[in-house]
């Protein structure tokens, strides 16, 4: 049904849903703080430049007693219950926060005439790419396949002078809600990744993965897996691995790698992270202090989703018009706006761009360094290290199949 | 009115140290982003660093190592720690506002003058 | 980061108009909307005369206009008067937190 808008007359309200079910089990009132220190932002920079009028969010809290896993397995209702709730007050403000499941967004795109936009930290899967008023500030899986694809494609570099055509990929079903998505983007076969390799296999159990290692039948030397390197560790242990084995770690929302004092483990020689490019302060702001590093990318979406709405509704009112018009909800996209970290480049669909970063495990020194980096605005990959200490023979990564190229 | 003051320039010798103070008035000055700017004698701008609103800092490359960049939000303060000066970093030093949008510095100070000689 | 590049000097007579471009790469100013402009008098700080490629702060005249094609913005002064003599840089977000100014332009009023 038609709800009104609380989105004008000076007056632009937010709304903020506060799932259960969340992409990371993170505390409510986490985010709470990081939308109020966004709010104070948003404020400041409005009456900065002359515009007197009133922001606020309204945080809309689900019962909890029906949803309560805590994961993003049964939020596909809780989003539609929260929205009936917003229904039924009759109280939806200029935009919606939230939700970071991608079964809720989806669901809620889906059963919704939106006429506002949507931001949502989080919202991974391929099923809410291309939505028209969905705007998502945590690299989605889409971005991911695109790197994987430029990379395997890649042969022009000192250190990688084979182009790689297949792949391995761990998927066990225990994953968080973002490694879920990502690997589920490159099982599904008709996903681009698919696509473009000529062999790929999914292994689920941990039996598999670890005969691929020293199988000499195997059929590629580079499997793909999504988490941290104890979850590596817990997998792989001390087992031996060929020396042209590749292990892709899709780390993205993890700085750890970039600390001073962190050395890499010996299992992790044969392994390349990939994760984002980290914030590169310690924010000691009120959202931030008592936050591990993947919990500090989910709360800052949250931060930077007002402060993009803040700069919409600052073009729209500078320009004179209208907040409550599909123009206005189809408006968070193909733009950079000023985050709290620094710049916050949208793709043409409202995904957010980033730079990721392939990091290797130096023999020398023990210590993660920065292979490459990739811009994914431009689909670009940038070489930093040319003559990488390597693990693998002549410091060059092997062919994805074996019996061909260094060994 | 909205005004960025700098200070704290002056004659240095290579290798030494200084540092620039920009006094924000007439802003929400934690709302915004903060820039140093430099103009070589005769030369173009050079954008030099910026500190966001959250507290996160960038550099030129010509820079980075050497210049620190801070804010003092509740003294509505802007500051730039320079060490290991080279006669190369000889400029007038402007501190910027960032509009909220990017690389679009709406206000400038007057600029303070470091000249880097032995 | 090389800088963009910019003619370093150019003229006009009074009432006349005159356009200074700004080229950079696929990486600057061709893969962002975000481009500016800035006029300097001499011995003053630079003044923001245009942002996001086309947009003009508030007392800024509307005599000038910014554009953008590819990798090549330009900053258009129509209706030339004496007191827009002046340097002129051009600047674009490239990506990351980095930004480049162009060389500067030098602009005489005949």
């Known amino acids: 049904s038609q709800v009104s808008q609380n989105c004008h007359n000076g007056s632009y309200e937010i709304s903020v849903l506060m799932m259960g079910n969340s992409a990371f089990a993170e505390p409510l009132k986490n985010l709470e703080d990081a939308v109020n220190e966004g709010l104070e932002i948003v404020r400041g920079r409005l009456q900065n430049a002359g515009l007197n009028v009133t922001v606020n969010a309204t945080f809309m809290y689900s019962d909890g007693l029906i949803h309560n896993s805590g994961d993003c397995r049964s939020s596909t209702c809780e989003g539609l219950d929260l929205l009936r709730k917003i229904s039924n007050a009759q109280r939806m403000g200029c935009v919606l926060i939230g939700p970071s499941c991608t079964y809720s967004t989806f669901q809620m795109y889906l059963d919704t005439e939106l006429s506002y936009p949507m931001i949502s930290a989080g919202s991974f899967g391929l099923s809410c790419d291309y939505k028209e008023t969905l705007t998502r500030l945590m690299s989605p899986a889409r971005k991911l396949m695109y790197f994987l694809v430029n990379f395997w494609k890649t042969n022009d570099l000192p250190f990688k002078t084979y182009s790689w055509s297949t792949s391995y990929v761990y998927k066990n079903g225990t994953e968080t809600e973002d490694c879920f998505w990502y690997l589920n983007a490159l099982e599904a076969s008709v996903s681009y990744f698919s696509h473009e390799l000529g062999f790929k296999v999914v292994l689920r159990q941990d039996k598999e993965f670890q005969d691929i290692l020293m199988d000499h039948n195997r059929k590629s030397n580079v499997i793909i897996m999504c988490g941290g390197p104890e979850f590596l560790y817990k997998l792989k242990g001390d087992r031996a691995v060929a020396e042209d084995i590749v292990i892709i770690l899709v780390d993205l929302f993890n700085d750890q790698y970039f600390e001073d004092n962190v050395t890499a483990p010996d299992y992790m020689k044969n392994v390349l992270v990939l994760t984002l490019s980290p914030g590169n302060s310690l924010l000691n702001s009120s959202f931030s202090r008592n936050l591990s590093p993947t919990k500090r990318d989910f709360a800052l979406a949250y931060l930077n989703g007002i402060l993009l709405f803040g700069h919409m509704l600052k073009i729209f009112l500078e320009n004179g018009e209208n907040i409550t018009t599909p123009k206005f909800a189809h408006a968070f996209r193909n733009l950079t706006f000023e985050g709290y970290d620094g710049p916050v480049t949208l793709d043409d669909w409202g995904d957010v761009d980033s730079t990721m970063v392939l990091l290797y495990t130096s023999v020398d020194t023990k210590k993660y360094k920065v292979l490459l980096t990739y811009d994914t605005h431009v689909n670009k990959t940038y070489p930093v290290d040319m003559s990488p200490t390597f693990t693998w023979k002549n410091s060059k990564l092997p062919n994805d199949i074996t019996g061909r190229g260094p060994q | 009115q909205v005004q960025l003051v700098e200070s704290g320039g002056g004659l240095v010798k290579p290798g030494g140290s200084l540092r620039l103070s920009c006094a924000a008035s007439g802003f929400t000055f934690s709302s915004y982003s903060m820039n140093w700017v430099r103009q070589a004698p005769g030369k173009g701008l050079e954008w030099v660093s910026v500190?966001?609103?959250?507290?996160?800092?960038h550099y030129a490359d010509s820079v980075k190592g050497r210049f620190t960049i801070s804010r003092h939000n509740s003294k509505n303060t802007l500051y730039l720690q320079m060490n290991s000066l080279r006669a190369e970093d000889t400029a007038v030093y402007y501190c910027a506002r960032g509009a909220g949008t990017l690389n679009a510095f709406d206000i400038w100070g007057q600029g303070t003058t470091v000249t880097v000689s032995s | 980061q090389s800088g963009l590049t910019q003619p370093p000097s150019t003229s006009g007579s009074p009432g006349q108009s005159v356009t200074i471009s700004c080229t950079g790469t696929?990486?600057?100013?061709?893969?962002?909307?975000?481009v500016s402009w800035y006029q300097q008098h001499p011995g003053k700080a630079p003044k923001l005369l245009i942002y996001a490629v086309t947009k003009r702060p508030s007392g800024v005249p509307d005599r000038f206009s910014g554009s953008k094609s590819g990798n090549t913005a330009s900053l258009t002064v129509s209706g030339l008067q004496d007191e827009d003599e002046a340097d002129y840089y051009c600047?674009?977000?490239?990506?990351?937190?980095?930004?480049?100014f162009g060389g500067g332009t030098k602009l005489t009023v005949l």
């Open positions: 696929s990486s600057d100013v061709g893969a962002y909307s975000y």
């Open positions: 600047s674009s977000f490239a990506g990351g937190s980095t930004l480049v």
């Open positions: 500190i966001y609103s959250g507290g996160s800092t």
